[in-house]
């Protein structure tokens, strides 16, 4: 069964890991995420108002996928960002970003995904978020749009 | 040399890992994979009829890339899914999915990839598979189409 | 702060990890990378003339993203490769590759990313590089174009 992790048997401490899935009642940025039901994982990391909150400094692999789609293509520029916020720093730091322009044929029904994933050195109290340019074009199915990380 | 892993020296137990590459004699779903030759890895996980079989419960990062291409674009909807099957459950569970519609200009030679990757809590005896919507549009080069996982 | 890693506290040895970001003064192949400033990580792995040099045999997750864009689409075929070179072998080995053809509307401003990531068994002295087909179409922003790995 895919669900909340039991601690892997060979480990004493809990593995720090998260896999959050799309939540269709996102109304504004940053995106909000399902943190309880379905194929969600949340262990050793907190979820707060759209953000994953790091509670232990170290190296993390961070990833996100967003599924954009629309009824009638007008090639609105799309962007998908994973960014970091920390009360010590005045500005958000964009960690990873994907952009798309001129990606479909005008007037047609269209669909496209953006995937991001990389390693970062994160500090306790860092908050990680996902931002998209066009909320109305995001499909929030749990298999299609997600956000996660794990501590190396 | 890239090939089957020797146990990493600092570990006693064998790392659970797989990297399978495209196999062009796939005739139906799920996709079949090369599990022996080339840059393939298979250690602590079994391969059976297109599926990776988990033999130890725990957290896994699972990924797949599929390379779609065609001689003449007709914008057939493309889908790429990683799904899980377990004898305890009646239905397949779609873990990750990518879809594409209206992605090329009618009549042109075209090429596009779909990449998926995320963390899941998997249970011993889970079987993981990859499905695509249009088998004839997949190119199975080992560097282009692959399926893998590793235990965190 | 995102920067060079301190050794994760529960580990004695340094984690082997790299995250390099786009460097706009790349003039030829392979791509060159920023290895010092910004959200860069380089620990237990060397950077030399565009390549990541492995100094310990084992299993690594290797990833790269490249952001292509242009002022006026002419659908030049795009390719993005991660390849390996070792003095013991005469030829480069392409580990992962993404290709795009017919991806934008002729004459329009366009933008598209390619993401690659997978697990490989690497040997001490392997050199890993990234190649693209059209250097002039790459945008080197640190959040958009990057290359990294970590030892499992």
């Amino acid at each position: 069964q895919i669900g909340h992790p039991s601690p892997p048997p060979e480990k004493k401490e809990l593995r720090k890991v998260a896999h959050l899935t799309g939540k269709s009642n996102s109304r504004s940025m940053p995106l909000e995420w399902e943190d309880t039901y379905g194929i969600v994982l949340l262990s050793g990391v907190k979820y707060k108002k759209g953000g994953l909150v790091i509670n232990e400094t170290g190296l993390y692999f961070v990833y996100s996928k967003v599924y954009f789609r629309g009824q009638s293509c007008n090639n609105l520029p799309l962007s998908h960002k994973v960014y970091m916020r920390n009360s010590k720093y005045p500005q958000d730091l964009v960690m990873m970003e994907g952009k798309m322009m001129s990606y479909c044929t005008t007037g047609q029904m269209w669909a496209r995904s953006s995937y991001l994933g990389a390693v970062f050195n994160l500090t306790s109290a860092d908050h990680l978020y996902v931002n998209v340019s066009e909320l109305s074009l995001v499909n929030f199915e749990e298999s299609q749009t997600f956000f996660g990380l794990y501590k190396l | 040399q890239i090939g089957h892993p020797s146990p990493p020296p600092e570990k006693k137990e064998l790392r659970k890992v797989a990297h399978l590459t495209g196999k062009s004699n796939s005739r139906s779903m799920p996709l079949e994979w090369e599990d022996t030759y080339g840059i393939v890895l298979l250690s602590g996980v079994k391969y059976k009829k297109g599926g990776l079989v988990i033999n130890e419960t725990g957290l896994y990062f699972v990924y797949s890339k599929v390379y779609f291409r065609g001689q003449s674009c007709n914008n057939l909807p493309l889908s790429h899914k990683v799904y899980m099957r377990n004898s305890k459950y009646p239905q397949d569970l779609v873990m990750m999915e990518g879809k594409m519609m209206s992605y090329c200009t009618t009549g042109q030679m075209w090429a596009r990839s779909s990449y998926l990757g995320a963390v899941f809590n998997l249970t011993s005896a889970d079987h993981l598979y990859v499905n695509v919507s249009e088998l004839s549009l997949v190119n199975f080069e080992e560097s282009q189409t692959f399926f893998g996982l590793y235990k965190l | 702060q995102i920067g060079h890693p301190s050794p994760p506290p529960e580990k004695k040895e340094l984690r082997k990890v790299a995250h390099l970001t786009g460097k706009s003064n790349s003039r030829s192949m392979p791509l060159e990378w920023e290895d010092t400033y910004g959200i860069v990580l380089l620990s237990g792995v060397k950077y030399k003339k565009g390549g990541l040099v492995i100094n310990e045999t084992g299993l690594y997750f290797v990833y790269s993203k490249v952001y292509f864009r242009g002022q006026s689409c002419n659908n030049l075929p795009l390719s993005h490769k991660v390849y390996m070179r070792n003095s013991k072998y005469p030829q480069d080995l392409v580990m992962m590759e993404g290709k795009m053809m017919s991806y934008c509307t002729t004459g329009q401003m366009w933008a598209r990313s390619s993401y690659l990531g997978a697990v490989f068994n690497l040997t001490s002295a392997d050199h890993l590089y990234v190649n693209v087909s059209e250097l002039s179409l790459v945008n080197f922003e640190e959040s958009q174009t990057f290359f990294g790995l970590y030892k499992l």
Partner: antibody, heavy 119, light 106 residues
């Protein structure tokens, strides 16, 4: 100027094999898809096969699938067509033709080479 | 497969005439149509793409029009060099040629 020159045609018995070549010059061969198109005596044009600029993908007409193999050597600026299990209906002039911008039409053609399959 | 049908199969005309060749597709091919000219014993020569775009170096007396399923190639004033066989080719879905139209001297 762009030039495509076919060779390797001739008379062959049914069931036998033949390999055609097409030597390219006057353009950057490795950046273009190349096709084979044939024309039976006194008949119209029939598309046979295409190979992509880097040789990674190949597509064939149903009439030759499984019997013909298209390949290329970009270091030699040469295209090939390996024809196996030849039939009388494969008798034709075979042209190599350069693809225009991955669009499946042909801006330059070779002069052709005649293949006759006869017992 | 998309079928391409040219008409007429043979056309007799004189130097200076305006001539039109028609090509019909069995289903809509938008504007994805090319025209070629072929002389006996020679390779085809590329004339027009995307139904109406003239290839560089092709005389302006040649023009193409149409979209969907009906297309025409027009030669505004026939020259001696224009007597040849003309083929249309669709590239909307794979590749198919028309059967050809032979343009002969009347």
């Amino acid at each position: 100027q762009v030039q495509l020159v076919e060779s390797g045609g001739g008379v062959v018995q049914p069931g036998r094999s033949l390999r055609l070549s097409c030597a390219a010059s006057g353009f950057t061969f490795s950046t273009y898809g190349i096709h084979w198109v044939r024309q039976a005596p006194g008949k119209g044009l029939e598309w046979v096969a295409v190979i992509w600029y880097d040789g990674s993908d190949k597509f064939y007409a149903d009439s030759v699938k499984g019997r013909f193999t298209i390949s290329r050597d970009n270091s030699k600026n040469t295209l090939y067509l390996q024809m196996n299990s030849l039939r009388a209906e494969d008798t034709a002039v075979y042209y190599c033709a350069r693809d225009r911008d991955n669009w499946n039409y042909f801006d330059y053609w070779g002069q052709g080479t005649l293949v006759t399959v006869s017992s | 497969d998309i079928q391409m049908t040219q008409s007429p199969s043979t056309l007799s005309a004189s130097v200076g005439d305006r001539v039109t060749i028609t090509c019909r597709a069995s289903q809509s091919i938008s504007s994805w149509l090319a025209w070629y000219q072929q002389k006996p014993g020679k390779a085809p020569k590329f004339l027009i793409y995307q139904a109406s775009s003239l290839e560089s170096g092709v005389p302006s007396r040649f023009s193409g029009s149409g979209s969907g399923t009906e297309f025409t190639l027009t030669i505004s004033s026939l020259q001696p060099d224009d007597f040849a066989t003309y083929y249309c080719q669709q590239y909307n879905s794979y590749i198919t040629f028309g059967q050809g139209t032979r343009l002969e001297i009347k």
